[in-house]
Every structure is written in C-alpha cells, then in structure tokens.
C-alpha cells in the first residue's frame, strides 16, 4: 500500500514538476525589467526563450520573435536545449510511468517488469529536473553577469550633456516557476526510485520446494533463475535481477554537450 | 465615436478642493489607461497623471504628488481628478485624454477650467 | 525630468512651402526593448484640444494627411510639413511618452506670412 502512494505521489509529483517546466519554457517573463532606483519609464521590458516582449503604460503590449537562431547568444541557445531535454525526458518519463503505476494492470505485466519501469522513470524525472535546474540556473548567472555590467555603466554620456536610459534586467517569474517546477520534478523522479525498491519481488537465492512424495526425495531448484510468467509460449529461464536493478542497455544515457549546438 | 466629456471646474480659493469628473463613451474604458493633462494660461501643456489599466498604477506630477488623486469607475465610464490644497499655479484648463499606443494621448476632451484665486 | 527644448518658438511661412521644427530631448527616448522612440508631435488650433498627430517619433496617427512626416531618434526629433496649407497653422507640441514626468515641450507656433 504504501509502494502504491509512494509511486502514485511520485507521479503526481512529477507530472506537476514537468506541467511546470513546460510552462516556464513558454513564458515570456524570463527576465523582466528592473524597476528598483531607475527612472520610472512609461515602457516596461521583459524577454523570453522565444521572444521580447514591451509592455507600455496605456495597455498596449507588443511581442517580437527570436527569428534568427545564429545570431542568439550561445547561452540562450544552451539553456532552450536544457529546457528541451528537460520537457522530453519527462514526457517520456510520464508515458513510462503510466505503464508502471501498480494501480494500473496491464495484461499479465509482472512486478518486476512494473519496478524496472518506475526506476526508468523515476531517473528520467531526476535527468530531467535537472535539467531544467540547470537551464535556468544558467540563465540567471547570464542575467546577474549583465545586471553587474550594465550597473557599472547605468548612464552612457555623450559628452556628459545626453544621458541613455540603461535598461537592466532581472529575475523574471519564470525562473522561479522553473526552479520550483525542476525541484518538483526531482522530488518525483527520487519518490518514484524509491516505489521501485518497493515493487521488486524480493526472493532468496535458494528456494527448497517439497513434495509430499514416498520416498525422501526432495526437488530443489536454483534461486538464481525462475521459470517465465512472461507473454506467449516462452518457457525459457530469465535471470532474476534482484531488486530490480537494470541490464546494460537499460541503462537511461545523459545528454552530451553536443545536444547544445 | 470616442468622446470624452470633463466637468467640475470652477473657481476656488488656494487651500481648496474641487473633484473634476471626465465622462468616457465610444471605446472601451476600463481596458485604457487615462490621464489628466493641464494647460496654463501662458498655453504650456503639462502632464498632471496617470491611471493604468486595472488600476495597477498611478503616476502624478511632482508638484501634484500629495494634493492629487486620480481615480476612475469602470462601470460609470468616468474618470476622475480630487484636487486638494490647490495653490494659484494649479490654475489652467484642465484636459483627461485616453493613452494610445507610444503612450501617446489618441483622444482628448474639450478641457475644463480651474481657477486658484483669492 | 527629462527637458524637452523646441525650436524655433514660432515660424512665419507662406502657403506651400516645406516647413521643419525641431524637438530635443535632455535624455535619449528610445527604448531598446523594441527599438522604438517614445515621443510624440501633437497639434493645437486655438480653442481646441491639442490633436495627436504622429507617435514612435515617425508613426503618423490615422487621419493625419500625409504631409505630416515624424523622423528623428534618441534626444533629437523633427517634424516636417511638406507642404503647409492654411490650415496647417497651429501650436506644435511634442512629448516624452517613455519616462514619468511625460514632459512637453514650449511648442512651436507656425504663422502665416
């Protein structure tokens, strides 16, 4: 029972934690002008992932798209990736976890089968919070670095007569929906490796099975393999891996540093 | 078509109080941000304040700040200017205009005048 | 405050001819969010209101003839009347619409000859 809440929470958790990095990533208030000892402007700035937008005193707000994608700064092309990664790892990770949720029964899909996809998903999650961590960390260390840069030089003078109006930005709403949002979805991935250790059928490596026979024969059977309940006529042996650890090429891989080109 | 109506100028006494009303009609009001906008005797034009939509923000003149309240009822179309302590540069005529795209003032009324005299 | 200083303080000129007037501003108006200058030209004939006629420094409201021409970006502003008709003489004022107090300049009074 309490493996079920463990990985239901999990799930909820998670599906909470990527509604929220999917969100983060369309909003438009990544940074948003900084209000704090500067004139008061009758215009207010606030940029996205995806776009600019100026929102002015009278109402009127007009957005323009990022339409190159060479002339974007390296960063924001690195922390659009991260959030990518981040939104499809844990869209996998939820189609995954649908299947494993011990609530739902499909076909005659065995326990450890069920612990083996909640730990996938389950890492899934944790990749992909990270991610998203990741993507706006970078992007308010991009946003503190120019927030320094354009406070050591807040007035341009031409000649000292003319002064420019520096407009300086800070932490927009979306990064900290997008903290909370990976935080959430770290928090589900960790819930949901936690259920699978739950989940794992735990049996001893020998098991002595009695028959009620004549004779004192007595039938063991190594505890290190176990006949198939699988699908179809398989009979064949599967080795057992206890607790529901993973083979090789079940191993979830990291995304390399060339997912951000 | 827009229309912008103001009323409730007069003459006062410095010190005084006078609340100057602005009748909205022909576009939608309470998804426009107003301001009130003074012109002297000598015709200089000088902004007094601003209501943002939603009643978010209120911007006043320096010398207003204190002494004015700009305020505005969505459901009646109007908008309003409660003027206090009124000193005898306070007098001009008085403009509310609708705040279009730039910021720019689109529409303005006819203007009513307020005197400040002993 | 951002000063607004118009010049000259009044023009005299014959019907047809090009007219400019010039408006500077003691801070720069143009907002690098969407690269657009915040000021405004407006027209006031006696005993009227003033009339907006071009905001963004170069959009002319609709309506306005296109005689009217805005240009101009950072502190220093222009508005150009290709060619004045009779009806063109009035008080010209512009604005700071991008930093509160949204200033107005002296204005410039154009008279016929």
């Known amino acids: 029972m309490a493996v079920t809440a463990c990985q239901g929470l999990g799930f909820v958790v998670s599906l909470i934690g990527i509604a929220g990095i999917i969100a983060a990533t369309c909003m438009d208030q990544w940074s948003t002008q900084d209000l704090y000892n500067n004139p008061v402007t009758a215009v207010f700035n606030y940029q996205g992932l995806w776009r600019s937008c100026v929102r002015e005193s009278s109402g009127f707000t007009e957005c323009r798209g990022y339409f190159t994608l060479l002339g974007l700064p390296a960063m924001l092309q690195a922390v659009r990736a991260l959030m990518i990664v981040g939104i499809v790892l844990g869209a996998i990770g939820l189609l995954v976890s649908i299947f494993a949720l011990k609530c739902i029964r499909i076909g005659s899909m065995e326990d450890s089968a069920k612990a083996n996809m909640t730990l996938t998903s389950g890492i899934m999650f944790i990749v992909s919070g990270l991610c998203a961590i990741a993507g706006v960390s970078v992007f308010a260390n991009m946003l503190v670095t120019n927030f320094w840069m354009s406070t050591a030089n807040m007035y341009t003078g031409m000649g000292g007569m003319v002064q420019t109006v520096q407009t300086r930005y800070t932490f927009g709403a979306a990064l900290f929906v997008g903290w909370v949002a990976g935080g959430l979805t770290l928090i589900g991935g960790v819930m949901m490796c936690i259920a699978c250790r739950g989940l794992a059928p735990e049996e001893t490596n020998y098991k002595a099975v009695s028959y009620h026979a004549s004779g004192h024969s007595v039938a063991y059977k190594p505890g290190g393999f176990k006949a198939s309940t699988g699908f179809g006529s398989n009979t064949k042996n599967k080795k057992i891996y206890d607790g529901g650890a993973r083979t090789e090429d079940e191993v979830q891989s990291y995304p390399s540093k060339h997912d951000y080109v | 078509q827009v229309m912008l109506v103001e009323s409730g100028g007069g003459l006062v006494k410095p010190g005084g109080s006078l609340k100057l009303s602005c009748a909205a009609s022909g576009f939608a009001f309470s998804s426009s941000a107003m301001s009130w906008i003074r012109q002297t005797p000598e015709k200089r034009l000088e902004w007094v304040a601003t209501m943002t939509v939603g009643y978010i923000y209120t911007y006043y003149l320096d010398t207003v700040k204190g002494r004015f309240i700009i305020s505005r009822d969505n459901a009646n179309n109007t908008l309003y200017l409660q003027m206090s302590s009124l000193r005898s540069e306070d007098s001009a005529m008085y403009y509310c205009?609708?705040?279009?795209?730039?910021?720019?003032?689109?529409?303005w009324g006819q203007g009513t005048s307020v005197t400040v005299s002993s | 405050d951002i000063v607004m200083t118009q010049s000259p303080s009044s023009l005299t000129v014959t019907a047809g001819e090009k007219v400019t007037m010039s408006c500077k501003s003691s801070?720069?108006?143009?907002?690098?969010?969407?690269?657009?200058?915040?000021l405004t030209w407006y027209q006031q004939k006696p005993g009227q209101p003033p009339k907006l006629l071009i905001y963004w420094a170069s959009t002319r409201e609709s309506g306005v003839p296109y005689r009217f021409t805005g240009s101009g970006s950072g502190t220093d502003f222009t508005l150009t009347i290709s060619s004045v008709e009779a009806e063109d003489l009035a008080v010209y004022y512009c604005q700071n619409n991008y930093i509160y107090p949204l200033t107005f300049g002296a204005g410039t009074k154009l008279e016929l000859k």
């Open positions: 801070q720069s108006l143009l907002n690098s969010g969407n690269q657009k200058n915040y």
């Open positions: 205009a609708r705040q279009g795209y730039g910021n720019a003032m689109d529409y």
